[in-house]
Amino acid sequence: MMTGTIETTGNISAEKGGSIILQCHLSSTTAQVTQVNWEQQDQLLAICNADLGWHISPSFKDRVAPGPGLGLTLQSLTVNDTGEYFCIYHTYPDGTYTGRIFLEVLESSVAEHGARFQIP
């Protein structure tokens, strides 16, 4: 039975040209995290594997940095980076937990961070 919950940074906004940290945290489960995949829509951004470490997908190498923790840092943001991001936790024995973050990249300097929320 899947008892865990994923807490994410929720709906966030950032300035064009700036950077942002995408963070997810899995709690309320003793399941072992074997791998975390970060995806943007259906595109693989990065992988963090318990045995093999971090992998940033080739097309994102210039603008994506691993961490902090199991999170992901997006740099040199463009308006095209606006959209949904998913952290997919592959755990044993629970299975797969998915967290969703919506990022809006703004032209102006009035970007604010949204509230944190939970996805069961």
Partner: antibody, heavy 120, light 110 residues
């Protein structure tokens, strides 16, 4: 079409060397962990070695440790297995295989294999 | 000697249900996923089951996988003559830091 094509097998004397290649096509090679698996005549499958996405982490079966070296050239979409100090018991069909995007899920694509015969 | 233990052979008649077992230890099957492969004579292995119980697209639902403790099993229902092949289980071993295979089970359709 997703494909793996091994080459480089052949007849070699005990103590000799051989380098196997595996050409990948139809997928983003950099995004996948790769392995070599072998099968001696009339025997079962034996995992040989694994390499992570950029080649900075490798694992080997005890039977080949110190003699075999796995490597990859992502710019050429090619996986390699350098085999030194070959023994009669290394005689086998060698398969290269792609790991599922979630490493621990298994090997989802296999090549057709290349035959290595170690004999005097 | 394989780290994972499988029966050497199994058999059944067409239409029957056959189960192949795979036994491991606490550092592999108990805490990791199991995958199963089918190898038809003279061909490369093909992934049948991943994540202990899931089927890749294209694999018939006659094939199913399950896991309990340090053991896993592959079940084939509605056995067909084309199922005659060798079947292998595998898992990542946390202690050995390596992929470990079962010795393989030769399935004969009588």
């Amino acid at each position: 079409e997703v494909q793996l094509l091994e080459s480089g097998g052949g007849l070699v004397q005990p103590g000799g060397s051989l380098r196997l290649s595996c050409a990948a096509s139809g997928f983003t090679f950099d995004d996948y962990v790769m392995s070599w698996v072998r099968q001696a005549p009339g025997k079962g499958l034996e995992w040989v070695s694994l390499i992570n996405w950029n080649g900075d982490k490798t694992y080997y079966a005890d039977s080949v440790k110190g003699r075999f070296t796995i490597s990859r050239d992502n710019s050429k979409n090619t996986l390699y297995l350098q085999m030194n100090s070959l023994r009669a018991e290394d005689t086998a069909v060698y398969y290269c295989a792609r790991h599922w995007i979630v490493l621990q899920y298994g090997l989802d694509v296999w090549g057709q294999g290349t035959t290595v015969t170690v004999s005097s | 000697q394989s780290v994972l233990t499988q029966p050497l052979s199994a058999s059944g008649t067409p239409g029957q249900r056959v189960t192949i077992s795979c036994s491991g230890v606490s550092s592999n099957i108990e805490i990791k996923y199991v995958s199963w492969y089918q190898q038809l004579p003279g061909t490369a292995p093909k992934l049948l089951i991943y994540n202990s119980h899931q089927r890749p697209s294209g694999v018939p639902d006659r094939f199913s996988g399950s896991k309990s403790g340090t053991s896993a099993s592959l079940a084939i229902s509605g056995l067909q003559s084309e199922d005659e092949a060798d079947y292998y289980c595998t898992s990542w071993d946390d202690r050995l830091k390596s992929w470990v295979f079962g010795g393989g089970t030769k399935l004969t359709v009588l």
